[in-house]
């Protein structure tokens, strides 16, 4: 039997999709301008190099960071490219519509461009979670619900808690993986029998796997210093993040080969492990003073990461149905959780130092952001896990999980499977 | 030594436009974030807009949010306001500021307005 | 936004007076709290940042203190060039920064 995409998504994917472009492009007629201040051309290339490294990490890091399926490469990859360039459209949008719309007209600048990049590569974390469960149009749903969710949470943290640029989007961490679990937890869990082999690696993707997880090694300490405000701080960020995520590489390969019993390699423990130290310092990489704290939180995020993809798939799978291999929600969700108490920590300790008396209320604080961040993804997750479960989707058949014959168009096969 | 000079002040008419700029010297002007505060005749001190170091990103105060763009070109070592369809109540010396960051311990960076230039008037009257 | 509120708004007091300056912001600010002194026709002058640290330059007779909501700053004996207007400035809810509406220091 032919493999074909079901009629009813043919049917509600194009207009759909399509429907949602015409009216972005009709919000961004009504509602934007370009800022027509830069003065200084040399700065405006500077100031795009940031974002085109934040692309770089969304398109082909995390878009191949997620193609390790056998049998789901592609749409892991193109989706997660669909998905960016949808969800940066409305990121835009939404960031202007919370913070500048009362005067007017949304002004779109490159720094606008590089907080949407980031609130659309929140959607790419979380998706890991959902790849090869999920068509297009349940994609669509997902983003603009997170997207939507990121913003509010951004401006809610930014209006009561008065935080900064950098420290209320490091909540991306926390928000996307507790997000894509709780999608992950209402979808269809079982993999009848017969798809098991859909959801294993193979070689040439894990491979190509291997190549988004070195670029986002390259790029986090992009991401870790793009929205700070000052030259110190970015310097810092950014020595930091590398200090943390060098560490992490040995740990990982080195922890991933103490975890096996024949001292093997694990390329799953490697692919999410890396990353590790740039998640866990980036609430707090712009403060630390010196490499060697960097180094340290390095060395224990990359522990925890190898320690949780070894006993955390198998938990994950019966619960949440999610594949041994999608292990950046969990991941996530354990560094961003070990970031945010980094960053308490160090409060506490420059309270104390500075004997202020503050310190039981900046503790409070934190702690009732990270606590924010955790409930409204928690609760947005679960919306779209019910929105992704009505009918109207027409959701693949459990039977075709992990599949790309679904939805892609392959020449050279005759027949489906 | 470090020094800022504003220019561009004068009288202008409601709903019309004026640009200020503000000539940096003495310190290495990309490396700092810029402030425009002013203060209206017997008043207090309003913060107005704020640029980061490398022209990435700007915020206003709600007063001004829309009608009012600050820039720069680290180039020619110069700040810039302008100013669209300028009301009566923005009638003030206009000054701007050096913005410093400095940490203490583990905290957050403190941002403070170390260098002042000496204010331009600007005179919003029909 | 935070709003920044200076007690008294003017004062008189004589050279070689203890003068104390109080600024209350209408939630926590932690130490993020800076002290600006401004003469009639000039452009307002750094005197302290972080709620206590001292620009440099300044004279070690200003000193500010206080963390959370309550702040003050102390002039330990007023000089004759020590009679301005004195602000204090909010730089914790970034990006809007707010001013108090300022302290006037008057020859008695």
């Known amino acids: 039997m032919s493999s074909k995409y079901p009629r009813s998504v043919r049917r509600c994917l194009p207009l759909w999709a399509l429907t949602l472009e015409a009216a972005l492009i009709l919000l961004f007629y009504f509602f934007t301008h370009y800022d027509a201040s830069l003065e200084d051309q040399k700065g405006l290339v500077a100031s795009y190099q940031v974002g085109q490294d934040l692309t770089v990490m969304a398109a082909i890091g995390l878009g191949f960071l997620t193609s390790s399926f056998r049998r789901h490469s592609w749409s892991s990859v193109a989706f997660n490219l669909f998905m960016l360039a949808l969800g940066v459209q409305w990121a835009i949008l939404l960031d202007g519509f919370l913070s500048q719309f009362p005067s007017g007209k949304v002004v779109i600048t490159l720094f606008s461009i590089r907080l949407a990049t980031m609130s659309a590569l929140s959607v790419l974390i979380s998706v890991d979670a959902v790849l090869g469960k999920v068509n297009l149009a349940q994609l669509v749903v997902m983003v603009l619900v997170e997207v939507t969710a990121l913003g509010n949470l951004r401006m809610v943290i930014s209006n009561i808690f008065n935080t900064d640029y950098h420290m209320n989007m490091m909540h991306i961490y926390v928000f996307a993986a507790y997000f894509g679990l709780s999608v992950a937890w209402c979808l269809p869990k079982p993999l009848p029998e017969g798809t098991e082999d859909k959801d294993q690696t193979a070689t040439i993707p894990s491979l190509s796997a291997m190549l988004g997880a070195l670029f986002l090694w390259m790029f986090w300490p992009s991401f870790n210093s793009a929205l700070l405000r000052s030259p110190i701080e970015r310097k810092n960020a950014v020595f930091n993040t590398y200090y943390a995520v060098a560490v992490s590489v040995v740990t990982a390969i080195s922890g991933s080969s103490l975890a096996h019993p024949q001292g093997k390699i694990s390329k799953t423990y490697v692919h999410s492990a890396v990353l590790a130290g740039g998640v866990a310092v980036g609430t707090s990489c712009h403060l630390i003073p010196s490499p060697w704290l960097a180094m340290v939180l390095g060395l224990v995020a990359g522990l925890i990461s190898v320690g949780g993809a070894k006993y955390l798939p198998g938990c994950c799978n019966r619960v949440l149905g999610i594949p041994h291999s999608s292990i950046m929600g969990y991941n996530f969700s354990l560094l961003g959780l070990l970031g945010e108490i980094i960053y308490i920590v160090l409060l506490v300790l420059d309270t104390v130092g500075a004997g202020n008396g503050m310190i039981g209320f900046q503790v409070l604080l934190s702690i009732g952001e990270l606590s924010l961040a955790i409930v409204i993804a928690l609760m947005s997750g679960l919306l779209t896990g019910l929105l992704l479960n009505l009918k109207i989707w027409k959701a693949p058949h459990e039977a075709k999980y992990f599949d790309d014959q679904v939805f892609w168009k392959f020449p050279h096969l005759a027949v489906g499977f | 030594q470090v020094q800022l000079v504003e220019s561009g002040g004068g009288v202008v008419q409601p709903g019309r436009s004026l640009r200020l700029s503000c000539a940096a010297s003495g310190f290495t002007f990309s490396s700092y974030g810029m402030h425009w505060v002013r203060q209206a005749p017997g008043k207090g001190l309003e913060w107005v807009a704020v640029?980061?170091?490398?022209?990435?990103?700007?915020d206003y105060a709600d007063s001004v949010k829309g009608r009012f763009t600050i820039s720069r070109d680290n180039s020619k070592n110069t700040l810039y306001l302008q100013m669209n369809s300028v009301r009566a109540e923005d009638t003030a010396v206009y000054y701007c500021?050096?913005?410093?960051?400095?940490?203490?311990?583990?905290?957050?960076?403190?941002?403070?307005?170390?260098?002042w230039g000496q204010g331009t008037t600007v005179t919003v009257s029909s | 936004d935070i709003q920044m509120t200076q007690s008294p708004s003017s004062l008189s007091a004589s050279v070689g007076d203890r003068v104390t300056i109080t600024c209350r912001a209408s939630q926590s600010i932690s130490t993020y709290l800076n002290w600006y002194q401004q003469k009639p026709g000039k452009a307002p002058k750094l005197l302290i940042y972080?709620?206590?640290t001292l620009q440099s330059g300044v004279p070690s007779r200003f000193s500010g203190s206080g963390s959370g909501t309550h702040f003050t700053l102390t002039i330990s004996s007023l000089q004759r060039e020590d009679f301005a207007t004195y602000y204090c400035?909010?730089?914790?809810?970034?990006?809007?920064?707010?001013f108090g509406q300022g302290t006037k220091v008057e020859i008695k």
């Open positions: 972080a709620a206590s």
């Open positions: 640029i980061w170091y490398d022209g990435s990103n700007k």
């Open positions: 400035q909010q730089s914790y809810g970034t990006p809007t920064w707010t």
């Open positions: 500021a050096r913005e410093l960051s400095t940490q203490r311990g583990y905290s957050r960076y403190h941002y403070v307005m170390d260098v």
